[in-house]
Amino acid sequence: QLPPGKPEIFKCRSPNKETFTCWWRPGTDGGLPTNYSLTYHREGETLMHECPDYITGGPNSCHFGKQYTSMWRTYIMMVNATNQMGSSFSDELYVDVTYIVQPDPPLELAVEVKQPEDRKPYLWIKWSPPTLIDLKTGWFTLLYEIRLKPEKAAEWEIHFAGQQTEFKILSLHPGQKYLVQVRCKPDHGYWSAWSPATFIQIPSDFTMNDEQKLISEEDLGGEQKLISEEDLHHHHHH
């Protein structure tokens, strides 16, 4: 029977800069029941506080609700593990909410095959930002990424959509059923999970030169232009 091993705070995430949650890994339990507590103070504060909510984030977590979350302050936190034989402390973790945002996935993903009479057919993809994110305040810039693949294919084709909430793709295999997903990330922060997949059947008469793709209208000043694979690669890395 031993004191508990050193715990580690391994992750903190915020869905929207308004709340956040941190998780820790327990060390060894020393063969005894072990209690964990997370204490914190904000930079410039003298007083230590204890985690306000150990429930919401699941086991070994601390959730900070709206009233406990300050965007412009660094939180300094540590976890204490205690059993009958003694205590051990994690290293201090410094957390700035601005840099730990991981949004929920985008919503309302809609995919449609468009076949205008006067132009080449294309796949039109549209989505909405996650509901918890308030883009109107200007605190957030969300960037989006789309991935798609034929149902039976192993490899995903990935497209960066910038800040747009819609995107057009030309190069697709006719007659195939495609899976399409979208995810988002703030300018500082982490990619969301991928949205649930939306399926779309590409008609057999969807014809296009496979070496040509259409990139986002915003990136090309609103014009619809065809560019080659080589140009596309250059465009994404300039």
Partner: antibody
Framework: EVQLVESGGGLVKPGGSLRLSCAAS????????MNWVRQAPGKGLEWVSS????????HYADSVKGRFTISRDNAKNSLYLQMNSLRDEDTAVYYC???????????WGQGTLVIVSS | DIQLTQSPSFLSASVGDRVTITCWAS??????LAWYQQKPGKAPKLLIY???TLQSGVPSRFSGSGSGTEFTLTISSLQPEDFATYFC?????????FGGGTKVEIK
Amino acid sequence: EVQLVESGGGLVKPGGSLRLSCAASGITFSSYSMNWVRQAPGKGLEWVSSISTRSSLIHYADSVKGRFTISRDNAKNSLYLQMNSLRDEDTAVYYCARWDAAAAFDYWGQGTLVIVSS
Amino acid sequence: DIQLTQSPSFLSASVGDRVTITCWASQGISSYLAWYQQKPGKAPKLLIYVASTLQSGVPSRFSGSGSGTEFTLTISSLQPEDFATYFCQQLNSYPLTFGGGTKVEIK
């Protein structure tokens, strides 16, 4: 509606003991640090003790250190103050108060009177 | 320990008056100061926290200002229900301390 109700006050001789309780309702009790504050008759407010959400941080005023013990039972939504070796100067109304760490003592009970007298 | 000194201790005023109460801290406490109102036989009621934030449900005639060592509570137009005792409290460091109080009486 948030309610904090203190009980356990009364008349006790110097050197005696009392245990105060504070029953909370209408709040997620386990999410808040809790405090005891007292007020001697006709005097100002004096902070006595505080206890954090899972009791890992406990603090006392110097005037009660070693004599008073604060504790909580989150399962029962209850806060306690065990008062030993009571003195005349401990005579006061004792309030329990919720501490919203983002703000201050935002909810208070109605108080319970403790009289220490021979 | 951080001492809080309130001034004045007593204040006579009339309905409609503008009232200012000052609280000095013996050392800097940033903005970690709260103001409470207490009426006879009742528990204190939170008015202002972090020096200037109005507690929900408190009338806007109450306002707080200051940081560091000097803080003020202002009642812009005194109402009959505002006659009470007012306390400041520092939440910067233990032991948490209260000012001695300011009793606002009817002139």
